[in-house]
Interface confidence: low
């Protein structure tokens, strides 16, 4: 029941463009070149498409033509070689050139950037963005899809077709509104908090793969499916997990067509199968593709079936463990996180996998034991405190969040944060840290049972942004150690992390704390960044102060702003008042 | 970057012959190979014709017998005779030449085919 056409073609180019259609093909090429050359004006990208384009329309007409059969990374990167300004612009990328595939590509995975210097993107004028969206919708629509995979080197391909398509969408219903703002702003918001989400968890998905491999990412997609679909039998489950691993791994290796492709076709399969996968997509399958795709993986989790036997028969009491085990180690423990995961909705998948790992570790040392049953029949018992530690964390957490809101909660992480890894530039400590304290709103008012999910799930994929931020600019050794020892003890070392004995406060610099009327007219969430900025430098400078030290200073941070901003000379009233809000602090903290 | 220029176009009797030519200039020190292609209205493009800088020729074999491809390196023009013209020849006949691959096009010239 292979869901992938396995039929060798005599061209991969022209195969790929027929299977999905121009506009598709031409979209696709355009996201892996933007996130190859990340640095490229849009005017050079969208010529180099329009030649790729051009040459697999020659190659659909006649697929023995010459070149029509070779890769596509051969094609894509013989492209990519001509951009004359490589040198120049990418430094030792141009290296990549000299080398032949399938190295090149590697070479070019390799210097994909997850935090290249390029301007912020500042949103026009809505009547600007109508104007440029009526003249000429495509250029338009191919701008966003650039813009948007040259920032986020990982993101998910055909998920940004879907993305792009919402985008257009917004802008035909709203440019013809009556109030253009109030309908487009909301809708524009919306995608790039999705849009940010949606990259943040791709991102986890090609470091699950590139960094511990395919067993790694399978383990993941067999505890989350096998939530998602518990009435699934093991072999329907592990099916869609070997074909949703070949799409992750084509997207992720920057084999965009196929991996579009491929999606289709799961999707379709899954759509074809859904009396034996799940009664909750009905919906999602009368969808169009695009939009089908995305409906699948966001699907809610399908009821229990009801009666499920005690997982001890199987995994525990069963004579034959060992015996079935030693047969088939990674079918075995693949069934055993299938049947745990089907009946645990409520735990978050790195919960799972953690005592996946901890029954195979248990199983590795006894089955070599002399009285194996003996051995492993407490196993269970090992399982109470790994389910009890996340469960507590949250539950503090919850109540801390509920108590401070989210920006004091996001501070109070900063904090945290910053004594445990001070070593980490303030900007990344500040992303990483509003991300964190984003898992409050996020997944506090959900009931217990959706709790855990929500939360650790999430804490996953914001501290996989810390792990790719740092290992492109490695300063901590203890950030390093979290990030690379185990995939799935990435949050509990983290929260492990005590405060870093060893850093050497940081030199005060009056000119870190000084602030300029243009704070005035920054929006709230811009201003929040500032304080917490500040923040930041702070703990830097006094790893020691006290919380209550902190909010002291904090608040008349607050204050300050607030009274120069009011002011009728606010340059002035920043200059003299901030003079002495520095020489307050200092006195405050002791520096 | 290379300019095409297609001619010749025309209508034309069933069984008759006509004479399309392409005219390249530019940046033709690059041009590894010349083609044509034609796009009959609903169609999909389809491949005709291809000379390599070389000489070597190929065809699809819808046309194989009765169309020919030539090209005048002196005057960077490639012609493409064709003989026995059928009513499912009539399309838009476009030039393509390129380095590596056929990316650069002329804007194309109409062939009918009708009694």
């Known amino acids: 029941r292979g869901v992938f056409r396995r039929d060798a073609h005599k061209s991969e180019v022209a195969h790929r463009f027929k299977d999905l259609g121009e506009e598709n093909f031409k979209a696709l090429v355009l996201i892996a070149f933007a996130q190859y050359l990340q640095q490229c004006p849009f005017e050079d990208h969208v010529k180099l498409v329009n030649e790729v384009t051009e040459f697999a329309k020659t190659c659909v007409a006649d697929e023995s033509a010459e070149n029509c059969d070779k890769s596509l990374h051969t094609l894509f990167g013989d492209k990519l070689c001509t951009v004359a300004t490589l040198r120049e612009t990418y430094g030792e990328m141009a290296d990549c050139c000299a080398k032949q595939e399938p190295e090149r590509n590697e070479c070019f995975l390799q210097h994909k950037d997850d935090n290249p210097n390029l301007p912020r993107l500042v949103r026009p004028e809505v009547d600007v963005m109508c104007t440029a969206f009526h003249d000429n919708e495509e250029t338009f629509l191919k701008k966003y899809l650039y813009e948007i995979a040259r920032r986020h080197p990982y993101f998910y391909a055909p998920e940004l077709l879907f993305f792009a398509k919402r985008y257009k969408a917004a802008f035909t219903e709203c440019c013809q509104a009556a109030d253009k703002a109030a309908c487009l702003l909301p809708k524009l918001d919306e995608l790039r908090d999705e849009g940010k989400a949606s990259s943040a968890k791709q991102r986890l998905k090609c470091a699950s793969l590139q960094k511990f491999g395919e067993r790694a990412f399978k383990a993941w997609a067999v505890a989350r499916l096998s939530q998602r679909f518990p009435k699934a039998e093991f072999a329907e489950v592990s099916k869609l997990v070997t074909d949703l691993t070949k799409v992750h791994t084509e997207c992720c290796h920057g084999d965009l067509l196929e991996c579009a492709d491929d999606r289709a076709d799961l999707a379709k399969y899954i759509c074809e199968n859904q009396d034996s996968i799940s009664s909750k997509l009905k919906e999602c399958c009368e969808k169009p593709l695009l939009e089908k795709s995305h409906c699948i993986a966001e699907v809610e989790n399908d009821e229990m079936p009801a009666d499920l036997p005690s997982l001890a028969a199987d995994f525990v009491e069963s004579k034959d463990v060992c015996k079935n085990y030693a047969e088939a180690k990674d079918v075995f423990l693949g069934m055993f996180l299938y049947e745990y995961a089907r009946r645990h909705p409520d735990y978050s998948v790195v919960l799972l996998l953690r005592l996946a790992k901890t029954y195979e570790t248990t199983l590795e040392k006894c089955c070599a034991a002399a009285d194996p049953h003996e051995c492993y029949a407490k196993v269970f018992d090992e399982f109470k405190p790994l389910v009890e530690e996340p469960q507590n964390l949250i539950k503090q957490n919850c109540e801390l969040f509920e108590q401070l809101g989210e920006y004091k909660f996001q501070n109070a992480l900063l904090v945290r944060y910053t004594k445990k890894v001070p070593q980490v530039s303030t900007p990344t400590l500040v992303e990483v840290s509003r991300n964190l304290g984003k898992v409050g709103s996020k997944c506090c008012k959900h009931p217990e049972a959706k709790r855990m999910p929500c939360a650790e799930d999430y804490l996953s994929v914001v501290l996989n942004q810390l792990c790719v931020l740092h290992e492109k600019t490695p300063v901590s050794d203890r950030v390093t150690k979290c990030c690379t020892e185990s995939l799935v003890n990435r949050r509990p070392c983290f929260s492990a992390l005590e405060v870093d004995e060893t850093y050497v406060p940081k030199e005060f610099n009056a000119e870190t704390f000084t602030f300029h009327a243009d704070i005035c007219t920054l929006s709230e969430k811009e201003r929040q960044i500032k304080k917490q900025t500040a923040l930041v430098e702070l703990v830097k400078h006094k790893p020691k102060a006290t919380k209550e030290q902190l909010k002291a200073v904090m608040d008349d941070f607050a204050a300050f702003v607030e009274k120069c901003c009011k002011a009728d000379d606010k340059e002035t009233c920043f200059a003299e008042e901030g003079k002495k809000l520095v020489a307050a602090s200092q006195a405050a903290l002791g520096l | 970057q290379v300019q095409l220029v297609e001619s010749g176009g025309g209508l034309v009797q069933p069984g008759g012959s006509l004479r399309l030519s392409c005219a390249a200039s530019?940046?033709?020190?690059?041009?590894?190979?010349m083609a044509w292609y034609r796009q009959a209205p609903g169609q999909q493009r389809e491949f005709v014709a291809r000379?390599?800088?070389?000489?070597?020729?190929n065809y699809p074999d819808s046309v194989k017998g009765r169309f020919t491809i030539s090209r005048d390196n002196a005057k960077n023009t490639v012609y493409l005779q064709m003989n026995s013209l059928r009513a499912e020849d009539t399309a838009v006949y476009y030039c393509?030449?390129?380095?590596?691959?056929?990316?650069?096009w002329g804007q194309g010239t109409l062939v009918t085919v009708s009694s």
């Open positions: 000379i390599s800088k070389g000489g070597s020729t």
């Open positions: 530019g940046s033709i020190e690059s041009i590894n190979r």
């Open positions: 393509a030449a390129g380095p590596v691959w056929e990316q650069f």
